[in-house]
């Protein structure tokens, strides 16, 4: 029987900069029941606070609701693991909410085959940003990535769309049914999950681009 091993806070994520959650990985338990507590203070403060919500984020997590989340202040936090034999602390972790945003997937993915008379045909893909992300404030730049593949293919073809919310693809295999998905990330945040797949049938007379 030993004191607990050192825990590690390894992940913090915010869906929209208004709330965030951090998760820790326990160290060894020393063969005894172990209690974990997360304490934090914000830049410019000395007063330590305990995690406001250990439930919402699941096991070994701390969730900061709206009233506990500030974009203006860096959070300094650590986890304490305690059993009957003693305690151990994680390293201090510094969190700026701006840099942990992982948005929801883009919405309203629409895919259409366009066949202009005077030009090569193309696949036109359009989507909307996730609703929780407020792009009007200006500091939030979302970048998008598209992936597509014929239904039975193993490999995805990836296209980086930058800040655009629509994209054209010229080179496709005629007569194939394609799956199309899109995801997004803030410039210094994390990629969202891929959106649900949209299917599109490419006509047999679709001319491949050279």
């Amino acid at each position: 029987q030993l004191p607990p091993g050192k825990p590690e806070i390894f992940k913090c994520r915010s869906p929209n900069k208004e709330t965030f959650t951090c998760w820790w990985r326990p160290g060894t338990d020393g063969g005894l029941p172990t209690n974990y507590s997360l304490t934090y203070h914000r830049e410019g403060e000395t007063l330590m606070h305990e995690c406001p919500d250990y439930i919402t984020g699941g096991p070994n997590s701390c969730h900061f609701g709206k009233q506990y989340t500030s974009m203006w202040r860096t959070y300094i936090m650590m986890v304490n693991a305690t059993n009957q034999m003693g305690s151990s602390f994680s390293d201090e972790l510094y969190v700026d909410v701006t840099y942990i945003v992982q948005p929801d997937p883009p919405l309203e993915l629409a895919v259409e085959v366009k066949q202009p008379e005077d030009r090569k045909p193309y696949l036109w893909i359009k989507w909307s940003p996730p609703t929780l992300i407020d792009l009007k404030t200006g500091w939030f730049t979302l970048l998008y990535e598209i992936r597509l593949k014929p239904e039975k293919a193993a490999e995805w073809e990836i296209h980086f769309a930058g800040q655009q919310t629509e994209f054209k693809i010229l080179s496709l295999h005629p007569g194939q049914k394609y799956l199309v998905q899109v995801r997004c990330k803030p410039d210094h945040g994390y990629w969202s999950a891929w959106s649900p797949a949209t299917f599109i049938q490419i006509p047999s007379d679709f001319t491949m681009n050279d």
């Epitope: 390894f10 974009m71 510094y94 700026d96 701006t98 840099y99 500091w139 994390y190 990629w191």
Partner: antibody, heavy 118, light 112 residues
């Protein structure tokens, strides 16, 4: 404890490439961005670029765009910085540095001296 | 790119005396999220840089309270209230509001 251990000094010919490694330990490698900063002899610090090891997403200083490639190998917890088309002005100490969930550098490697000379 | 200008270039200080380093940026360092990402690093002789102050005025873990940072917008200052022998080295200001991140040219502090 957090450690960033870099590869050893290199001497390279003009026009060639160099690849510097930065092995991370003491934390979950995929959690935090790794940055590369260089320092020419007797000069200041110059940020080259950064990588998120969780998905290898990169941002580069446009000054080095096309010449620098930053990669990460999750299996060995190692980040790499490759600089191509070397010239004498690239003689410098190259540092890797780690952020938290922030955009400043809390931990630094020991530095790797790259000398470009014919 | 944002140009960071530090003054003075070098500083010779008697132990126990104060020291002050100025840093000016070519454009405002207020991020569109409201934060100011101006930091100070110290590079001791033969060592890698180490973080002293983040976001203008916040001491990093383990940094003695004789170090303090202040300023806003484009003008920033690092003060050492009582210089000690271990404080010798080159001090750099750095901004991470705008990409590419940039550093000042450095201020060399030595002991008289």
């Amino acid at each position: 404890q957090v450690q960033l251990v870099q590869s050893g000094a290199e001497v390279k010919k003009p026009g060639s490439s160099v690849k510097v490694s930065c092995k991370a330990s003491g934390y979950t490698f995929t959690s935090y961005w790794i940055h590369w900063v260089r320092q020419a002899p007797g000069q200041g610090l110059e940020w080259m670029g950064e990588i998120d090891p969780s998905d290898s997403y990169t941002n580069y200083n446009q000054k080095f765009k096309g010449r620098v490639t930053i990669t990460a190998d999750k299996s060995t917890s190692t980040a790499y910085m490759e600089l191509s088309s070397l010239r004498s002005e690239d003689t410098a100490v190259y540092y890797c540095a780690r952020s938290f969930f922030t955009n400043w550098f809390a931990y630094w490697g020991q530095g790797t001296l790259v000398t470009v000379s014919s | 790119d944002v140009v960071m200008t530090q003054t003075p270039l070098s500083l010779s200080v008697t132990p126990g005396q104060p020291a002050s380093i100025s840093c000016r940026s070519s454009q405002s360092l207020v991020h569109s999220n409201g934060n100011t990402y101006l930091h100070w690093y110290l590079q001791k002789p033969g060592q890698s840089p180490q973080l002293l102050i983040y976001k203008v005025s916040n001491r990093f873990s383990g940094v003695p309270d004789r170090f303090s940072g202040s300023g806003s917008g484009t003008d920033f200052t690092l003060k050492i209230s009582r210089v000690e022998a271990e404080d010798v080295g080159v001090y750099y200001c750095s901004q991470s509001t705008h990409v590419p991140f940039t550093f000042g040219g450095g201020t060399k502090v030595e002991i008289k």
